[in-house]
C-alpha cells in the first residue's frame, strides 16, 4: 500500500507516517520515521500531561498559592494536575479555583440555608414568619420564635424576622 492518509486511535499522521502518540505522563522527543518508533520521555517533577499526546513540553502543575487562600486538595502526578481548594472559612471564586474569598455571612433576618464548602458560598434565606435570626453568621439557621404558651406565658412583644417574641406572665386579674 501507499503511505496512509489517516491513522488509528492513539496515532498521529506526520510526513506520511502514522506515529504512536505519547502516553499520558510523557512528552514527545521525536516523531517516528520509516525506521524508528516515536520517542517519548516522562514529564519531570511538578509537570504533567493528562492525555495521549504529541506535546514537546509537559504542563506545569497548578500552584495553590496560600496568599490567595488556597491549599492542595490533591497532589498532582505526571498524569494529573494538582487540585486546589480553599482554606477553612473560604471558598473558590471560580470552577478553576484560582483564588478564594471569605464565606458570606447571613445578615440578621436571614438564616443559613446551605453551609459553604471549599467550592461554594454560603446560601442564605429570609427567615419566614415564626422564625428569626438576630446575628450575622455563616452557620446559624433561622431559629423558631419561642413558644410562650408551652411555658405558660403570654406574648408581650411580637417577634420579627430579626427578633424573638418576648414572653411575659399571664394577667392574674382575668375574670
Amino acid at each position: 500500500p501507499e503511505p496512509p492518509t489517516a491513522c488509528r486511535e492513539k496515532q498521529y499522521l506526520i510526513n506520511s507516517q502514522c506515529c504512536s502518540l505519547c502516553q499520558p505522563g510523557q512528552k514527545l522527543v521525536s516523531d517516528c520515521t520509516e525506521f524508528t518508533e516515536t520517542e517519548c520521555l516522562p514529564c519531570g517533577e511538578s509537570e504533567f500531561l493528562d492525555t495521549w499526546n504529541r506535546e514537546t513540553h509537559c504542563h506545569q502543575h497548578k500552584y495553590c498559592d496560600p496568599n490567595l487562600g488556597l491549599r492542595v486538595q490533591q497532589k498532582g502526578t505526571s498524569e494529573t494536575d494538582t487540585i486546589c481548594t480553599c482554606e477553612e472559612g473560604w471558598h473558590c471564586t471560580s470552577e478553576a479555583c484560582e483564588s478564594c474569598v471569605l464565606h458570606r455571612s447571613c445578615s440578621p433576618g436571614f438564616g443559613v440555608k446551605q453551609i459553604a464548602t471549599g467550592v461554594s458560598d454560603t446560601i442564605c434565606e429570609p427567615c419566614p414568619v415564626g422564625f428569626f435570626s438576630n446575628v450575622s453568621s455563616a452557620f446559624e439557621k433561622c431559629h423558631p420564635w419561642t413558644s410562650c404558651e408551652t411555658k405558660d406565658l403570654v406574648v408581650q412583644q411580637a417577634g420579627t424576622n430579626k427578633t424573638d417574641v418576648v414572653c411575659g406572665p399571664q394577667d392574674r386579674l382575668r375574670a
Epitope: P1, S20, V29, S30, D31, T33, E34, F35, T36, E37
Partner: antibody, heavy 112, light 112 residues
Framework: EVQLQESGPGLVKPSETLSLTCTVS?????????WNWIRQPPGKGLEWMGY???????NYNPSLKNRVTISRDTSKNQFSLKLSSVTAADTAVYYC?????WGQGTTVTVSS | DAQMTQSPSSLSASVGDRVTITCRSS???????????LNWFQQKPGKAPKLLIY???NRFSGVPSRFSGSGSGTDFTLTISSLQPEDFATYYC?????????FGQGTKLEIK
Amino acid sequence: EVQLQESGPGLVKPSETLSLTCTVSGYSITSNYYWNWIRQPPGKGLEWMGYIRYDGSNNYNPSLKNRVTISRDTSKNQFSLKLSSVTAADTAVYYCARLDYWGQGTTVTVSS
Amino acid sequence: DAQMTQSPSSLSASVGDRVTITCRSSQSLENTNGNTFLNWFQQKPGKAPKLLIYRVSNRFSGVPSRFSGSGSGTDFTLTISSLQPEDFATYYCLQVTHVPFTFGQGTKLEIK
C-alpha cells in the same frame, strides 16, 4: 532532496585507522533519523556497522569488537566513521545512509 | 542478534513473471507497540542500495506498484507481480527492530 556524500582515503595500511566522513545536505542530522554506516566487501552482502542518532547517541555492531566509533560535527552537518586496527578483511565499499537515502559509496582498500 | 535468512539466494526468471522472495528472522520483529520494522532494498552492480519497502508493506515514494511486501512476526515476503527488465538486481531484507540491525544475505534475480 536529502543527499549524502562519503569522503576519505581509498587506501589504508593494515593496523591503521580507517577514517571516513559523510556530508549531509537537504536535512539537518540533529532533526531526526539515525545516521548509519554500512559496508559491503567485494562480491558479498551488506553489513550494518553502527549509527549515530539525531541526539548524538550511538549504537554499534558488536561483531566489530569495539573497533568502530561514529561521531558528528553538527556545524558542518557531517558524521564520521573511524575503524581501528584494520586488516584486509575490512576492504569494502563503505556507505553512509539514512536508510531511505544513501551515499553513492566509497571504496576503501586495506593494503600495505 | 536477529539472524535474517533470505531464500532463494539466487533466482532466474523472465520478464512478466511473478516473483516471490522470502526473508525469515530468528526472532519476532514486532515491537511492543505492534510495529514491525522490516525493509526491502534493491541493489544494482556498482550502485548503492535503494529502499523499496519499509515497515513490511509500505512502498517508498517513487517505487512502482508491482513491488509489494507482506508478512508478520518472523516471516516476510517481497513480491514483484510482473517482472520488468530493470528489476534484475540483488534484493536484501533489513530488520531495524533490534540492535544490531541485520541484513539478509541477498537474493540475486537474474534473467532466464
